[in-house]
């Protein structure tokens, strides 16, 4: 092809490429062709012929202005016509007369700003037709019934005003799952105009100002339609009653939308036509007071989001929203709810009280002052089958006992970004009998004590990373009673004695974050008593990350019971010389990281049994020695393994010796030196 | 099962010393701390010391610690508790009792060992 | 060190009787008490730990309660296998001390 088309498996694309013409020279079994971005004016149907397979074609973001009716005869197996972004103006009864097996049709962004006549009356199997973005009118698209197939009506980001019977009644025979027009200026919905559509199952009305009385209107509208899902995000909806969505009680409307609209009040009863209601979307208002039978009604809710609902209007504690007891009682079935990113005093006895059904609950950043969690603070979820509670960003300064003692259900507990700092007594994880994961990092500081976990011997992933963690090198070890933990993290933590019983018995650890301490000393062979073999035992541990310690010295049997490590990080270490069999039992390692050392030399007795199953190697930025007892070995591996090597040729450079001296390793010559082959 | 079962009585006299081993079966011996009990006759029960028999780390009552050596022979998969300078109050029931999944009980225990300190 | 307190040291009781044991520590030990059961020339049986929760194979007539410094084991109904010596013993910091014990026998 002299054109820069990519083909591959039957598709071309020739996308950015400044082309004023259909490429001529592409195979003729090609499917699916892009032309977007480039520079075409027309579409000549002559160009197409040799490419009759075609059953995707995208030109969008082109400069076309008229489409040629015979477009689709030389494309009789056309079912994706993208359009968009073109200069489209006119579309007359012949424009896709011929393009009948389409079943998506993109027009978005031209300049398309009345349909006339009947131009998609022959798209029987259209499902998608985009008309955003352009500039019409109204939604009239024809004069009689068709486009028995449609199921999404895209009209968003036009300058539609009314919404009349007698321009959607074209539709009489559609079921249209989603009839788009967001961004409009409606203003009127006219008696009758959704009962013209066969079905409707979606509405999406956002970015319209409907304010509170357009919005009864419009749900006065959809009574008795098939209306499923109904989106009215930032419609200036500042409050509700229990007349807004009255109209609503004859459908089965499962999904709501109401985000983005600065509601204030949430006047009781409000949703109490909704009974069918399953998901609903509350995000980014200005809720100043939800009342205890705002959400009365709301039988079926799985899922609510209420991020950023409950904001303060001023600095002043009076200001703070406030949401009554017993206010979610209502919601029987609710399984997740989000309410991250608020300014709620605090939780209340009974706030939770009656979600015999939540599973999740997110309360990060919710609060203003949450400091201390008592054995009251979750009282009201005692009922509640939660298991993933994320209390993160609340500026917790302490857990007192039996905090969460009514969570009995609870897998996950995410306590990070707090300002935690206390002993640990244990007491604070009670009742906690099915516990899978605590998340404790980025806190101030937590002071362990043999029955820190005594009571939560279920927990497979325990998070400390950070916490300016305290006691770790007691016996018997704090971790002792984990016997079923898979991943710990105690990175950053500036950890500096541990003893070799820390992670006794920890044989199911698989992920082990150990980076940015200060264990050093315990690998050095004049530390009082010798080296601190503190991973002994560690059958099944695959990843290891021991990066920034400061570590120069590592004993020759430290990694013997690693046998199914895969990942090791010793990278932004000091290390220089490593004993000849470090690796030997590490057969199955795939990564390895050693970058930023003071490793000179890489010789096979070291290095060859790790690296002999690598996919990835990271030595980058080590003074490598560039002679022939040194790297021999390792160049003539580099340049044979099929290891991933990230940056060989700009920084794995020679040091050593001064005229080899920023010179890239992977050149170094090995032809004169000998016994250097990598394999044998 | 888990089991326990320790050497059997001795008779001592004062100022001698006595070793009590207690052989653990059923488990792996490394993986539990084994703590030792003493009951002398009509008292109540007395913690000694428990020791960690995978690197023979041991933490002690202040109240025994110059007199009580607890040792373990792994290969054994055996602990000993030795006392030295006895006296008639040493005159007791010595037991070896394992923590569980739960590290906050004794649900495993050693038959006991009766010691008695007499002249 | 933590000292442990019970009461009463002895107590008669029949058949079917509810009986309430008592264990004092002299510092807060939080829910980390255990109950143990000794007969005559037995080693202690394991009862309960963490303050209530029951053993394996423990009946339940065998109840606990209590945190911080006072507990308490309660027996619903006695029944003959239950007359023994019974003892509380902490589990917070070494050395974990027990208490003096409580003997229950037969009225």
């Known amino acids: 092809s002299t054109t820069k088309c990519t083909v591959s498996h039957e598709v071309a694309d020739c996308s950015h490429l400044k082309l004023t013409q259909v490429p001529d020279d592409l195979p003729t079994n090609i499917t699916v062709l892009n032309l977007t971005h480039n520079q075409l004016r027309r579409l000549p149907a002559a160009n197409f012929t040799r490419y009759s397979q075609l059953t995707s074609l995208d030109v969008g973001f082109n400069t076309i202005s008229k489409l040629e009716p015979e477009l689709c005869q030389k494309l009789p197996m056309l079912k994706v016509l993208n359009l968009q972004h073109n200069e489209l103006s006119q579309l007359s009864d012949k424009t896709f007369a011929f393009c009948t097996n389409l079943t998506e049709l993109h027009l978005m962004s031209n300049s398309i700003q009345k349909i006339k006549n009947n131009p998609f009356v022959k798209q029987k199997n259209l499902i998608t037709l985009d008309l955003s973005h352009n500039g019409l009118s109204s939604t009239k698209l024809g004069t009689q019934v068709q486009l028995e197939n449609l199921q999404e009506l895209l009209l968003s980001n036009n300058k539609i005003q009314a919404l009349k019977s007698e321009e959607l009644d074209i539709f009489a025979n559609s079921s249209l799952k989603k009839l788009e027009l967001s961004s409009n200026q409606i203003k009127e919905f006219s008696p009758g105009c959704f009962h013209a559509i066969g079905r409707l199952f979606g509405l999406f009305l956002n970015n319209v100002q409907l304010g509170p009385s357009l919005t009864e209107k419009l749900c006065l509208e959809l009574a008795n339609t098939s209306i499923r899902n109904l989106s009215l995000s930032n419609s200036q909806l500042s409050t509700t009653s229990n007349t807004t969505f009255l109209g609503l009680k004859w459908t089965n409307l499962t999904m709501l939308d109401l985000s983005y609209n600065n509601l204030n009040v949430v006047g009781n009863d409000s949703f109490a036509w909704l009974p069918q209601l399953e998901y609903f979307f509350l995000e980014y208002n200005n809720i100043q007071h939800l009342f205890s039978h705002s959400l009365h009604g709301l039988f079926n809710v799985r899922y609510l989001n209420l991020k950023r609902s409950f904001t303060k209007q001023s600095i002043s504690l009076a200001s703070l929203p406030k949401i009554d007891d017993f206010s979610f009682q209502w919601l029987k079935c609710l399984e997740h709810l989000n309410m991250e990113d608020n300014d709620i005093p605090g939780i209340k006895s009974n706030m939770f009280t009656g979600l015999i059904n939540l599973k999740y609950l997110s309360l990060s950043n919710s609060f203003t002052s949450l400091r201390t969690l008592t054995n009251e603070t979750f009282v009201s979820l005692a009922h509640s089958p939660l298991h993933i509670l994320n209390l993160t960003k609340n500026k917790i300064s302490k857990i007192e006992s039996d905090a969460f003692s009514w969570l009995g259900h609870l897998e996950v507990l995410d306590l990070g970004l707090n300002e935690i700092g206390q002993e640990l007594t244990g007491q604070e994880w009670r009742g906690l009998e099915n516990i899978f994961e605590i998340y404790l990092s980025y806190n101030k500081y937590l002071q362990l004590t043999r029955n820190s976990f005594a009571l939560v011997p279920s927990l497979q992933r325990l998070m400390l990373r950070r916490v300016a963690l305290k006691n770790v090198d007691s016996s018997p070890s704090p971790f002792q009673p984990l016997r079923n933990l898979t991943i710990l993290d105690l990175s950053n933590n500036n950890i500096a004695n541990i003893n070799d019983d820390m992670l006794e018995g920890l044989e199911k650890l698989e992920i082990l974050d150990l980076q940015h301490n200060n264990l050093a000393r315990l690998w050095k062979h004049a530390n009082p008593g010798g080296p601190i073999y503190f991973l002994k035992g560690l059958s099944h541990l695959h990843i290891l990350n021991l990066e920034s310690n400061g570590f120069d010295e590592i004993p020759v049997e430290v990694f013997k019971d690693l046998f199914e490590l895969k990942i090791i990080d010793l990278g932004l270490n000091n290390l220089n010389t490593l004993p000849a069999s470090v690796f030997n039992n590490q057969v199955s390692l795939k990564s390895l990281n050693l970058q930023k050392n003071l490793i000179t030399s890489v010789e096979k007795k070291v290095f060859g049994p790790a690296f002999r199953n690598l996919t990835e190697l990271d030595m980058r930025f080590n003074p490598f020695d560039c002679t022939c007892e040194s790297i021999a070995w390792f160049v003539n591996w580099i340049n044979e393994t099929h290891t991933n090597i990230p940056e060989l040729s700009s920084h794995y450079l020679c040091n050593t010796p001064p005229h080899y001296h920023g010179f890239p390793v992977r050149l170094f010559d090995t032809s004169s030196c000998k016994d250097s082959a990598p394999f044998e | 099962q888990v089991q326990l079962v320790q050497s059997g009585a001795e008779v001592k006299k004062p100022g001698a010393s006595v070793k009590v081993s207690c052989k653990a079966s059923?488990?792996?011996?490394?993986?539990?701390?084994i703590h030792w009990v003493r009951q002398a006759p009509g008292q109540r029960l007395e913690w000694m010391g428990e020791?960690?028999?995978?690197?023979?780390?041991?933490n002690y009552n202040e109240k025994f610690k110059t007199r009580v050596t607890i040792t373990r022979d792994t290969s054994a998969s055996t602990a000993y508790m030795e006392l030295s300078s006895l006296r008639s109050e040493d005159t007791a029931v010595y037991y070896c009792?394992?923590?569980?999944?739960?590290?906050?009980?004794?649900?495993?225990w050693g038959q006991g060992t009766l010691v008695t300190v007499s002249s | 060190d933590i000292q442990m307190t019970q009461s009463p040291s002895s107590l008669s009781a029949s058949v079917g009787d509810r009986v309430t044991i008592t264990c004092r520590a002299s510092?807060?030990?939080?829910?980390?008490l255990a109950w143990f059961q000794q007969k005559p020339g037995k080693a202690p049986k394991s009862l309960i730990y963490?303050?209530?929760t029951l053993a394996d194979g423990v009946p339940s007539r065998f109840s606990g309660s209590g945190s911080g410094t006072d507990f308490t084991l309660t027996i619903s109904s006695l029944q003959p296998e239950d007359f023994a010596t019974y003892y509380c013993?902490?589990?917070?910091?070494?050395?974990?001390?027990f208490g003096q014990g409580t003997k229950l026998e037969i009225k």
């Open positions: 009792a394992r923590v569980g999944v739960m590290i906050t009980t004794f649900p495993y």
């Open positions: 059923g488990y792996t011996f490394t993986t539990y701390w």
């Open positions: 020791i960690n028999p995978n690197n023979g780390r041991i």
């Open positions: 510092g807060n030990i939080h829910n980390y």
């Open positions: 963490n303050a209530k």
């Open positions: 013993q902490h589990f917070w910091s070494t050395p974990f001390t």
